[in-house]
Amino acid sequence: SEVEYRAEVGQNAYLPCFYTPAAPGNLVPVCWGKGACPVFECGNVVLRTDERDVNYWTSRYWLNGDFRKGDVSLTIENVTLADSGIYCCRIQIPGIMNDEKFNLKLVIKPAKVTPAPTRQRDFTAAFPRMLTTRGHGPAETQTLGSLPDINLTQISTLANELRDSRLANDLRDSGATIRIG
């Protein structure tokens, strides 16, 4: 039930996770961990944000997007085969028990012997394509956990957040955005 992403050894891997702050700068704590989302928090935390800033991170793991606008997608630098596995993005929405859990599966492939053109490699490194195709509706909610009635008024596709990106079509079905407020 995890959404699957791929990257090649030596590239940067990109694992998307988004939410829409209720108001500009009104941030929500987020944690990223290696391994499926546990009951609480994130196991083996690699990065954490609070209401103001990134307050914990480990080497090679960073947020490349504007986390102040809710882009908490994780970039893993210079991946190796050991980076394969499930990663947990947990958006700790304020209120009674409103956490949203996303389990994303990263598959690392050995580097190709013949490198692809630079432009294509750059795109692939930043935004690896999904391996699994997901439709909208019930199947998509499998990656979301429960959606509380309060504070969550809309789920939109990742492509909406990236509508100005030339890669929007590639990413149309590759994730979900939580809107708060």
Epitope: A36, C37, V39, C42, D50, M97, G145
Partner: antibody, heavy 115, light 107 residues
Framework: DVQLQESGPGLVKPSQSLSLTCTVT?????????WNWIRQFPGNKLEWMGY???????SYNPSLKSRISITRDTSKNQFFLQLNSVTTEDTATYYC????????WGQGTTLTVSS | DIVMTQSPSSMSASLGDRITITCQAT??????LNWYQQKPGKPPSFLIH???ELAEGVPSRFSGSGSGSDYSLTISNLESEDFADYYC?????????FGAGTKLELK
């Protein structure tokens, strides 16, 4: 290693308030994790009651919402359960537990509600 | 609340046997399921996370499977230390809810 130890009165009268303490050693309760209370009724049914996490955020089981409060004292590395208006139905063994998956548990403290 | 129906409530088996305990949720819980073991007079201990992932130190004779609303715990080649109570826990949705437990006894 994380160690937890519950302490409490053992016997409480109906309609009174119950206060339990969980003392944590080997780890700071402000570093990480959710710090939970779970109870086990006679007959062994388990019920999750609520938690306070490392940043002080709390969350409670809605079935107890009006009666429960979980607080902490970071200077003593302790967290607390208060349950108001207890009845005989609250007779149980109370555990404090933490970790992402309830990895660490106290030994439990038995509470009897009786007049 | 999500109700976890665990079966059987008790069972007896012999050393070396293979047994399976099941948990059924009242809705799809998307693999958000853990298993715990409890021995008499002790607190529960963490056994399996996210359906299949064994907790640290758990022997490989324990395994989990399932998806949607149906999950199972299998113990192969039962050893004496495995006779205990077992509980499933769903954490897909709050409040967290446990199964009623399965008591595994020596035949």
């Amino acid at each position: 290693d994380v160690q937890l130890q519950e302490s409490g009165p053992g016997l409480v009268k109906p309609s009174q308030s119950l206060s339990l303490t969980c003392t944590v050693t080997g780890y700071s309760i402000t570093s990480d994790y959710a710090w939970n209370w779970i109870r086990q009724f006679p007959g062994n049914k388990l019920e999750w009651m609520g938690y306070i996490n490392y940043s002080g955020r709390t969350s409670y089981n809605p079935s107890l919402k009006s009666r429960i409060s979980i607080t902490r004292d970071t200077s003593k590395n302790q967290f607390f359960l208060q349950l108001n208006s207890v009845t005989t139905e609250d007779t149980a063994t109370y555990y404090c537990t933490s970790g992402g998956n309830f990895d660490y548990w106290g030994q439990g403290t038995t509470l009897t509600v009786s007049s | 609340d999500i109700v976890m129906t665990q079966s059987p409530s008790s069972m007896s088996a012999s050393l070396g046997d293979r047994i399976t305990i099941t948990c059924q949720a009242t809705q799809d819980i998307v693999k958000n399921l853990n298993w715990y073991q409890q021995k008499p007079g002790k607190p529960p201990s963490f056994l399996i996370h996210y359906v299949t992932e064994l907790a640290e130190g758990v022997p490989s004779r324990f395994s989990g499977s399932g998806s949607g609303s149906d999950y199972s715990l299998t113990i192969s080649n039962l050893e004496s230390e495995d006779f205990a109570d077992y509980y499933c826990l769903q954490f897909y949705e709050f409040p967290l809810t446990f199964g009623a437990g399965t008591k595994l006894e020596l035949k």
